[in-house]
């Protein structure tokens, strides 16, 4: 397993509709054709997997059917969007990138993006 640098923004504020987007960029040492991206959430010293996708370079990211994440890739950048967020989902979202194929296997873990989500106060049919 070889290390790889992964960059992501320090802070992102989710929209009033509970949508947060950020870019995860990795410094690919070689010409990977298969990449796996995982988003982890760290809060209260607990780490949980939010979503994961494997993609072939040049193709769309494919998340599981029930995933709250969507994303697109462009070169060594992955644009990630997480939906349905509310205040209790505030936390540090860590981007983990694995270059699966061809060998050698590379692993990179970002420092995390602190996503802040605010619950709006009562108002006509606002998004919570």
């Amino acid at each position: 397993c070889k290390a790889m640098h992964v960059a992501q923004p320090a802070v992102v504020l989710a929209s009033s509709r509970g949508i947060a987007s950020f870019v995860c960029e990795y410094a690919s040492p070689g010409k990977a054709t298969e990449v796996r991206v995982t988003v982890l959430r760290q809060a209260d010293s607990q780490v949980t997997e939010v979503c994961a996708a494997t993609y072939m370079m040049g193709n769309e990211l494919t998340f599981l059917d029930d995933s709250i994440c969507t994303g697109t890739s462009s070169g060594n950048q992955v644009n990630l969007t997480i939906q349905g967020l509310r205040a209790m989902d505030t936390g540090l979202y860590i981007c983990k990138v694995e270059l699966m194929y061809p060998p050698p296997y590379y692993l990179g873990i970002g420092n995390g993006t602190q996503i802040y989500v605010i619950d709006p106060e009562p108002c006509p049919d606002s998004d919570f």
């Epitope: 509310r86 209790m88 619950d119």
Partner: antibody
């Protein structure tokens, strides 16, 4: 085990207020949102509002904005739903239901419901 | 106002039949939709969340699909205990509106 236990049935006169409680146990109270949903006799489900027991913030369906108040007491793990200006069409069974943060591992929204509280509005 | 329209509003089917209920939402909600079964005199029971995830303890004859604005609940082989009213609900953000319900009866 997870339980949401609601207060007993109420009979109120038009114009009065009713306050229904929902006591949670078997999980961390402040880690889940709580919703209130009602169902009039022979009718469908109607979402009323949501409260964050951690901070106390809430949001209500538009039709209840001027009459609904949702509060919580973290010391007793209880949420309250108060509906004022009661009219006959408010006669319904009122339910509380919990809802985890979407990023909670294996968390399913509205997985546990209270047993329901029948509120009858009659003169 | 956000609307959820279920169809049909009622249906009658035989034991063993494949039954499909649809839910159309007036705006894109990604996959954030629940399905419930409510038997007469009982509280609603969560069947499916995030459009296709089967809730723990729910029989595998229930399945959900769809995303965006069009969703489907399927019962692969109808059982007598499935006599109930079925509801869809958006969980994308407030308001967490329910569909009007689909009443399912056994022929």
């Amino acid at each position: 085990q997870v339980q949401l236990v609601q207060s007993g049935a109420e009979v109120q006169k038009p114009g009065a207020s009713v306050k229904v409680s929902c006591k949670a146990s078997g999980y961390t109270f402040t880690s889940y949102y709580m919703h209130w949903v009602r169902q009039a006799p022979g009718q469908g489900l109607e979402w009323m509002g949501i409260i964050n027991p951690s901070g106390g913030s809430s949001n209500y369906a538009q039709k209840f904005l001027d009459r609904l108040t949702m509060t919580r007491d973290t010391s007793t793990s209880t949420v309250y739903m108060e509906l004022s200006g009661l009219r006959s069409e408010d006669t319904a069974v009122y339910y509380c239901a919990r809802d985890p943060p979407i990023t909670m591992f294996r968390g399913a929204p509205f997985d546990y419901w209270g047993q329901g509280t029948l509120v009858t509005v009659s003169s | 106002d956000i609307q959820l329209t279920q169809s049909p509003s009622s249906l009658s089917a035989s034991v063993g039949d494949r039954v499909t209920i649809t839910c159309r939402v007036s705006q894109d909600i990604s996959r954030l939709l629940n399905w419930y079964r409510q038997k007469p005199g009982e509280i609603p029971k969560l069947l499916i969340y995030r459009a296709s995830s089967l809730q723990s303890g729910v029989p595998s004859r229930f399945s959900g699909s769809g995303s965006g604005t069009d969703f489907t609940l399927t019962i692969s082989s109808l059982q007598p205990e499935d006599i109930a009213t079925y509801y869809c609900q958006r969980t994308y953000s407030a308001p967490y509106t329910f569909g009007q319900g689909t009443k399912l009866e056994i022929k």
